[in-house]
């Protein structure tokens, strides 16, 4: 079907448009273009008879049209009046007519917009401002930008009048920004210059600086006042209620004790008509006082609280110094000094931060020291320790257990045997014990200040016979050439000898074997697969002896370099190829094969029936031990010859 495509569909005034013809029939006599949706001789633009190779302009020809042999029509220097439909009338050689209509729209190139405002100096929290994008243009879209960003979502921002007007209700100082509007139509987009909104605000409550309120006699007093305000505030100073001067700064040289008093700064905004005041009390000392330390927390809790130590009083133009444990401050990320060195902050205090702390004020002649301050850091209780560490006793001896837990204030202790409370003491003493005294001995430590409690339980066995020992290990699956293993013979018993056997033999001499802890612990450094043996420990005293059950060490190793069998590398065509891969590994490895780099199957055996020369190539076996995280591989070249071409070839499996 004959169709007309307008390129582009939306055309800017002054530009050009191509009415492109699709599916033009073959065997044409000629064609003619018309303005409008129908064939009308009075509105003919141009006609073309192919056989004459000549085009004839019609009544609607403007000189801006160019016709092409493929019937497409180019219209140049487009004007608004060109908008609309265009009809192509095609006459075929058999004199059958065909028509198609296309259209395009013409839009003006937009002018640069500008912003008008209904209020050039709005007052904060009081006025609204309406910005309007000029000029009003038909078929144009209006957009707004604030600081070159699209409009934020805000209930105080409202678009109206087809987005041509942007209203800001209840303006705030934060609305002081660059505002731009943009006009768009299908052919152009233009942005205005920015308009800066000037919001009148303030004054806010003024701030007087510097903050220090203590001065020494003879110093200069120089106070500055500032209040956020637009336009900038006008300032006035009052001393003890009496007006002094209308300046932002107040300067009094060589002050005396008589200059002590209340100093008021008043800020006034002439446009908003608002006033705000701030008062500071200034104290002038005859001589520098002895400094003293104040703390914001007298009983800080370890690892929880921070403590701020402040050197008082605050005196202008003074150097503050600090000492901890009679030393200057150590470098520590937990110690922070304020800009004026007057405040020392200890972040996340520890029990080691008790001090003593001293501060000093340096004057012309000497340094005045404060009295030392010691921090009372509350901590603990830590896990209590029960001593001695023995767990086996013989009947008839005295049992004397002592409990200790680091704590501030000192912990309160309680003893329980088999869950039953015994006494509230730090030590537990039982004379002439019997088998009946065997059981669970619990020490409970309690910190009354923090409310925290911690307990430790110890199993005590009273027996003439030594128990059957057992072996505990710090690593149940060590990796070869990487890990160490420590075996410990349990339990720990009084007046007892500990012995070790490996595979039923006494310990071999080896630099990798080490006994410690009264021979109770056996450590194997850098284990190897040969260390995977049966380990037994024994205990003995003057009355009895006993041995543990054997513990077999499970050493993870490998995979070693795999071996592919059979070793043959030459095969006859038609034979079966049956390759098996094996690698020493614990645990057993995962196997996979690749032929010429292409992954095959995840099996230990690779089987290919009736091989041909196409099966020539490199056969790689990959092994991987997930436990050790190690991998290995081997590559074998296989050659397959056509039957009977080479002597000594394997027939395969």
């Amino acid at each position: 079907k004959l169709t007309i495509e307008s390129t582009p569909f939306n055309v800017a005034e002054g530009k050009e448009v191509l009415l492109l013809v699709h599916n033009l029939p073959q065997h044409l006599f000629g064609y003619s273009w018309y303005k409008g949706e129908r064939v009308d001789g009075n509105r003919q633009i141009i006609g073309y008879v192919i056989g004459t190779q000549q085009a004839t302009p019609g009544p609607a020809y403007s000189g801006r049209e160019i016709i092409y042999p493929n019937a497409s029509l180019l219209i140049q220097n487009i004007i608004q009046n060109d908008t609309g439909f265009y009809t192509l009338h095609v006459i075929k050689s058999d004199l059958v007519n065909e028509e198609a209509t296309g259209q395009f729209r013409v839009y003006p190139e937009l002018p640069k917009p500008s912003i008008s405002s209904n209020n050039s100096k709005p007052v904060e929290d009081k006025d609204a401002v309406a910005f309007t994008c000029e000029p009003e243009t038909q078929d144009a879209t209006y957009l707004w930008w604030v600081n070159n960003q699209s409009l934020p979502v805000s209930p105080r921002l409202q678009l109206s009048n087809g987005n041509r007007t942007l209203t800001l209700f209840n303006v705030t100082r934060n609305d002081t920004a660059s505002y731009k509007c943009e006009t768009q139509n299908p052919v152009s987009a233009r942005r205005s210059d920015s308009v800066i909104l000037n919001v009148l605000y303030g004054p806010d409550a003024p701030t007087i600086s510097p903050l220090n309120t203590s001065y020494r006699s003879g110093e200069n007093l120089n106070l500055s006042c500032h209040a956020a305000s637009n336009p900038p505030a006008q300032y006035s100073w009052f001393v003890n209620g009496t007006f002094q001067q209308s300046t932002q700064e107040l300067f009094i040289p060589n002050i005396t004790v008589n200059n002590s008093g209340s100093y008021t700064c008043q800020a006034h905004n002439s446009d908003t008509g608002l006033n705000r005041t701030t008062v500071t009390t200034i104290t002038v000392y005859a001589e520098p006082p002895k400094p003293f330390i104040t703390s914001n927390n007298s009983n800080p809790v370890e690892d929880e609280d921070a403590v701020a130590l402040t050197c008082e009083p605050e005196i202008q133009n003074t150097t503050y110094l600090w000492w901890v444990n009679n030393q200057s401050l150590p470098v520590s990320p937990r110690l922070q000094l304020s800009n004026d060195n007057r405040t020392l902050t200890l972040l996340s205090v520890t029990r080691n931060d008790v001090g003593p702390y001293e501060c000093g004020i340096q004057n012309e002649l000497s340094v005045d020291h404060s009295d030392p301050v010691i921090l009372n850091v509350l901590y603990g209780p830590d896990d209590p320790t029960i001593s001695p560490s023995y767990t086996y006793y013989r009947p008839g001896v005295n049992l004397s257990l002592s409990c200790h837990a680091a704590s501030n204030p000192p912990a309160q202790y309680s003893w329980l045997i088999d869950g039953n409370i015994q006494q509230h003491t730090q030590e537990l003493f039982i004379s002439n014990i019997t088998e009946k005294n065997s059981g669970l001995y619990t020490c409970q430590a309690n910190n009354s200040a923090s409310g925290h409690s911690r307990t430790t339980v110890k199993t005590i066995t009273v027996s003439a016979e030594l128990p059957k020992p057992s072996i505990s290990s710090n690593n149940s699956k060590p990796v070869e050439d990487k890990d160490a293993v420590a075996f410990t013979c349990e339990p720990e018993a009084q007046n007892t000898t500990y012995l070790w056997w490996v595979n039923g033999q006494s310990l071999p001499v080896s630099p990798r074997l080490q006994l410690s802890n009264g021979n109770r612990t056996l450590t194997l450094f850098n284990v190897t697969r040969n260390d995977a043996r049966a380990y037994v420990c024994g205990i003995q005293n003057s009355v009895s002896a006993n041995r543990s059950d054997p513990v077999t060490l499970d050493v993870l190793y490998g995979p070693d370099t795999p071996i592919i069998s059979p070793p043959d590398s030459s095969y006859l065509s038609g034979a079966n190829l049956n390759l098996s891969c094996h690698s020493a590994s614990n645990p057993s490895p995962q196997y996979s094969w690749r032929i010429n780099g292409i992954p095959q199957q995840h099996t230990q055996v690779l089987f290919i029936a009736k091989i041909t020369p196409n099966n020539n190539g490199t056969y790689a076996c990959f092994v991987s031990n997930l436990a050790t995280g190690r991998n290995n591989s081997i590559v074998k070249s296989i050659t397959v010859s056509a039957s009977g071409t080479s002597p000594g070839l394997s027939a395969g499996a």
Epitope: I50, G51, Q53, Q54, P57, G63, I66, P69
Partner: antibody
Framework: QVKLQQSGPELKKPGETVKISCKAS????????MNWVKQAPGKGLKWMGW????????TYADDFKGRFAFSLETSASTAYLQINNLKNEDTATYFC???????????WGQGTTVTVSS | DIELTQSPSSLSASLGGKVTITCKAS??????IAWYQHKPGKGPRSAHT???YIQPGIPSRFSGSGSGRDYSFSISNLEPEDIATYYC????????FGGGTKLELK
């Protein structure tokens, strides 16, 4: 881009025949007619006629009927001007020029000089 | 047949100046007129076509006007490369050239 490339200069004797070529490129040859223009030494341009490259039909100006023949080799996108029984007054530069659909000449060849001398 | 009378046959002008060439037809040619610039040893090239609105490659210094039988072609702000012979052409089913105007530098 559109280009019309004409053959080189010719030196002929009176009574002989000359055939000059104009090879077109950069457009579909059969879409536009081809004109021939003569410029005798020291004279102005003179339109000789044109050939319809679609139908092959030639049109000759009155002064160029008889000894002059326009022809085509469409497959080679080439137009030819043949002058038979050359005379001394045929000494001139001959231009081929493509005719836009609106009939004015939009592209020209560089010209071929024909000299007729005994 | 339509005849075109082009004048002047030659013309001297200064660089930066303006020149005007006229062409008079023996009858109304309905603005079917084109102007060509011809330099020795080269093929002529379009200088202006009155019927066509936009002509790529033609300097804006070149302009044409006229209707009925009388037509003119002007070059403003003359430049060295404008020195050539200029012809008017009436184009229709049959074509007619004017006699040419040789433009020289003063």
């Amino acid at each position: 881009q559109v280009k019309l490339q004409q053959s080189g200069p010719e030196l002929k004797k009176p009574g002989e025949t000359v055939k000059i070529s104009c090879k077109a490129s950069g457009y579909t040859f059969t879409d536009y007619g081809m004109n021939w223009v003569k410029q005798a030494p020291g004279k102005g341009l003179k339109w000789m006629g044109w050939i319809n490259t679609y139908t092959g039909e030639p049109t000759y100006a009155d002064d160029f009927k008889g000894r002059f023949a326009f022809s085509l080799e469409t497959s080679a996108s080439t137009a030819y001007l043949q002058i038979n029984n050359l005379k001394n007054e045929d000494t001139a530069t001959y231009f081929c020029a493509r005719k836009d659909l609106l009939r004015y000449f939009d592209y020209w060849g560089q010209g071929t000089t024909v000299t007729v001398s005994s | 047949d339509i005849e075109l009378t082009q004048s002047p046959s030659s013309l001297s002008a200064s660089l930066g100046g303006k020149v005007t060439i006229t062409c008079k037809a023996s009858q109304d040619i309905n603005k079917y007129i084109a102007w060509y610039q011809h330099k020795p040893g080269k093929g002529p090239r379009s200088a202006h076509t009155l019927h066509i609105y936009i002509q790529p490659g033609i300097p804006s210094r070149f302009s044409g006007s006229g209707s009925g039988r009388d037509y003119s072609f002007s070059i403003s702000n003359l430049e060295p490369e404008d020195i050539a012979t200029y012809y008017c052409l009436h184009y229709d089913n049959l074509h007619t050239f004017g006699g040419g105007t040789k433009l020289e530098l003063k």
